[in-house]
């Protein structure tokens, strides 16, 4: 199968203090709400997260073989799967000026692929057929990005809290997909 992972580890993407990837545009007036220009807020701030693990954009590393029908890559490739939640509740006070954080609902950010890389792989086929070279497009990094109508919905499918956090004692597994869907994604050349 395309998803034969024999190694996986995770990298957590944590925005720098006061940083917020692609801050939402102010939709109402231009009044600044950055407390830092104005003495700042006390150290205890309402929107500091109670639990840092509640929101995190993680890069899960998976090593696997690329398959194309009966052919399989000579060597495994390592790529990332973006996993986890993104949300302002986990950000610290300096980010307050960037959006209307106090609202009950706001810009929806998702942990999705940010950069891709192309990798050339050699596919070995059974029956003595000649090896074939194929360029595959692999996820190179993940980022919290605001949802827009232009995002590919397959990248953004919401799998709910259970999928966002693997169960204890169980290794995170990549999303199950049909072989064809997986193959198409992997062989999408630049």
């Amino acid at each position: 199968q395309g998803w034969q992972a024999f190694k996986n580890d995770a990298t957590e993407i944590i925005p720098e203090l006061g940083e917020y990837p692609e801050p939402p545009p102010e939709l109402e007036n231009n009044k600044t709400m950055n407390r830092a220009e104005n003495g700042g807020r006390p150290p205890h701030h309402p929107f500091e997260t109670k639990d840092v693990s509640e929101y995190s954009c993680r890069e899960l590393h998976f090593t696997r073989y690329v398959t194309d029908g009966q052919c399989r890559s000579a060597k495994p490739v390592t790529e990332l799967v973006c996993s986890g939640q993104c949300g302002p509740a986990r950000l610290l006070p300096n980010a307050i000026g960037r959006g209307k954080w106090w609202r009950p609902s706001g810009p929806d950010f998702r942990c999705i692929p940010d950069r891709y890389r192309a990798q050339r792989v050699q596919l070995l086929c059974p029956g003595g057929a000649a090896p074939r070279a194929r360029k595959v497009r692999l996820v190179a990094s993940c980022k919290c990005k605001r949802l827009t109508r232009f995002h590919n919905q397959s990248e953004l499918k919401d799998f709910g809290p259970e999928a966002a956090r693997p169960q204890k004692g169980r290794k995170p597994r990549p999303r199950a997909r049909g072989a064809k869907a997986n193959q198409a994604e992997l062989e999408n050349a630049y």
Epitope: M33, H44, F47, A89, W102, R103, P104, L147, R149
Partner: antibody, heavy 119, light 112 residues
Amino acid sequence: EVQLVESGGGLVQPGRSLRLSCAASGFTFDDYALHWVRQAPGKGLEWVSGIGWDEDMIDYADSVKGRFTISRDNAKNSLYLQMNSLRVEDTALYYCAGNNRGYGGLDVWGQGTTVTVSS
Amino acid sequence: QSVLTQPPSASGTPGQRVTISCSGSWSNIGSNTVNWYQQLPGTAPKLLIYNNNQRPSGVPDRFSGSKSGTSASLAISGLQSEDEADYYCAAWDDSLSGEYVFGGGTKLTVLG
């Protein structure tokens, strides 16, 4: 125990004014953004207005803009809604609600106070 | 007429799984986080789901939220009689000056 208690509701004639209050206890008041949400008899919920921890952070529903004013007094742990030029369609149960987590929904609610606008 | 559209009613028997949908547009559900509220008869609403799929502490894991494009849904598995209530979705709407909008509500009836 986290508690929000609304008061100030009553029967009022169209065009008149009313001031609702919401008293908070059991939590650090200025950690919360506060909102008014109303529910007309037999109808659904309608958000009216919200306020962050200072006067720069205020939003209103279009239906009440220019007529209602939200304010808070952190020293008194109180939230207010000044309602002017009341209309029959403002008749509803008015809830005070709060959130202390950015974009985290309204996680604290009062039991509501009834406002009836009728001639 | 609510900005967010929900079916007026839904029903199921104890133990069943029920899903309530909420449809909006790119100015609300499409680009902002979705919250779900439960309102038991004669009581104030209670936050059930925030940030599309997060449960506040104390909310059973039988309740789950999801979102795709301009629609969201609330799923209740292992339906119980005490789940009979009105359910509302809500999201910030960026159109005009912006406001927090609710769906019209769905009355969930637990049969038998």
